[in-house]
């Protein structure tokens, strides 16, 4: 399996989180890894132990401190390794020089709640969890709407290149079911990738007056 | 883009030793791991030694453990592999190679994962 594609990934959620994915192609592994985090310029480490996500691949959580410590700065650099057992002794996987601001992951929005709902138009606001201060204003987010009849897939994205925690969504159809999911990115890091989707919020616009026209 | 620029090869004795260095300029990256590969008339490219972004960690094929040593000097965004105890069937055509994401280890030898390649400096080993 040294020949197989390997890959090992971990990204920041920007305050005291680390989550790594471990994965061998055409591996069976039935042996314990762990990842072990060894910052260069901190007294503490800490370790995670992998476990199964998929046949081929394994996932963890470092846990750096309560959930909105700031544990890493920008001039942090993380030693990464998977270790797995063999036997007695335990083997070096992979080993990277992890910087925690050039791959950051944000956890998904939360909160999300319906300000005013009309029956063309939907004001909903969300909030951003566990986001570092230092991102400041440096943020983007992503927002889509499903339709009726329609999947997430379909759904056009709307985007948002700024810090803002709102979007007024228009030319909804009166008295109809959507739901909406937001994500959002820092503007920084190479390795920066989207958070996960919100979980949905949905919301009914509200019906066209008898006798209105619409 | 990214250029790398691989020097210092050419003929040693078998016993003798050779320093070889990559220089590479363009666009530069945050964690990459850089690595020396190989490859012999006739033979498929093979892993040599990686190492860290920070130089910390290295990576050594069992072929070459204890007479190769992989270096770098991110000052200088060089790569350099010191080449001990050299013997005939090291005679290859030397890659230097960047991966971007910067993973080294056993799993991790693949010429595959690497995006960045130089175009090789020729060492032969006489006996």
């Known amino acids: 399996a040294v020949n197989g594609t390997s890959q090992f990934t971990c990204f920041y959620n920007s305050r005291a989180n680390i989550s790594c994915v471990w994965s061998q192609d055409g591996a069976l592994q039935d042996t314990s890894c762990q990842v072990h985090a060894w910052p260069d310029r901190r007294r503490w480490n800490q370790t995670c132990e992998l476990l199964p996500v998929s046949q081929a691949s394994w996932a963890c959580n470092l846990i750096l401190g309560a959930p909105d410590s700031q544990k890493l700065t920008t001039v942090d650099i993380v030693t990464l390794r998977v270790l797995c057992r063999e036997g007695v002794r335990w083997r070096v996987m992979a080993i990277q020089d992890f910087k925690p601001f050039e791959n950051l992951r944000l956890m998904a929005p939360i909160s999300l709640q319906v300000v005013h709902v009309e029956t063309h138009r939907c004001n909903i606001s969300w909030e951003i969890s566990q986001a570092s201060h230092y991102f400041e204003r440096h943020l983007e987010f992503e927002a889509r709407t499903l339709s009726p009849g329609h999947t997430w897939e379909e759904a056009p994205l709307l985007t948002l290149k700024q810090k803002q925690e709102w979007i007024c969504l228009e030319t909804l159809t009166p008295d109809t079911q959507y739901e909406f999911q937001v994500r959002v990115k820092p503007l920084q890091g190479e390795f920066t990738t989207w958070s996960p989707w919100s979980q949905p919020l949905a919301f009914r616009t509200k019906p066209a007056a008898l006798g209105k026209d619409t | 883009q990214v250029q790398l620029v691989e020097s210092g090869g050419g003929l040693a004795q078998a016993g003798g030793s050779l320093r070889l260095s990559c220089a590479a300029s363009?666009?530069?990256?945050?964690?990459?791991?850089k690595a020396w590969f190989r490859q012999a008339p006739g033979k498929e490219r093979e892993f040599v030694a990686a190492?860290?972004?920070?130089?910390?960690?290295?990576d050594y094929a069992d072929s070459v453990k204890g007479r190769f040593t992989i270096a770098r000097d991110n000052a200088k965004n060089t790569v350099y592999l010191q080449m001990d105890s050299l013997k005939p069937e090291d005679t290859a055509v030397y890659y230097c190679?960047?991966?971007?994401?910067?993973?080294?280890?056993?799993?991790?030898?693949?010429?595959?994962?690497?995006?960045?390649w130089g175009q090789g400096t020729q060492v032969t080993v006489s006996s």
């Open positions: 190679a960047v991966y971007p994401q910067g993973t080294i280890g056993p799993y991790f030898r693949s010429s595959n994962h690497y995006d960045y």
């Open positions: 363009g666009r530069t990256f945050s964690q990459d791991a």
């Open positions: 190492i860290t972004w920070s130089g910390r960690d290295t």
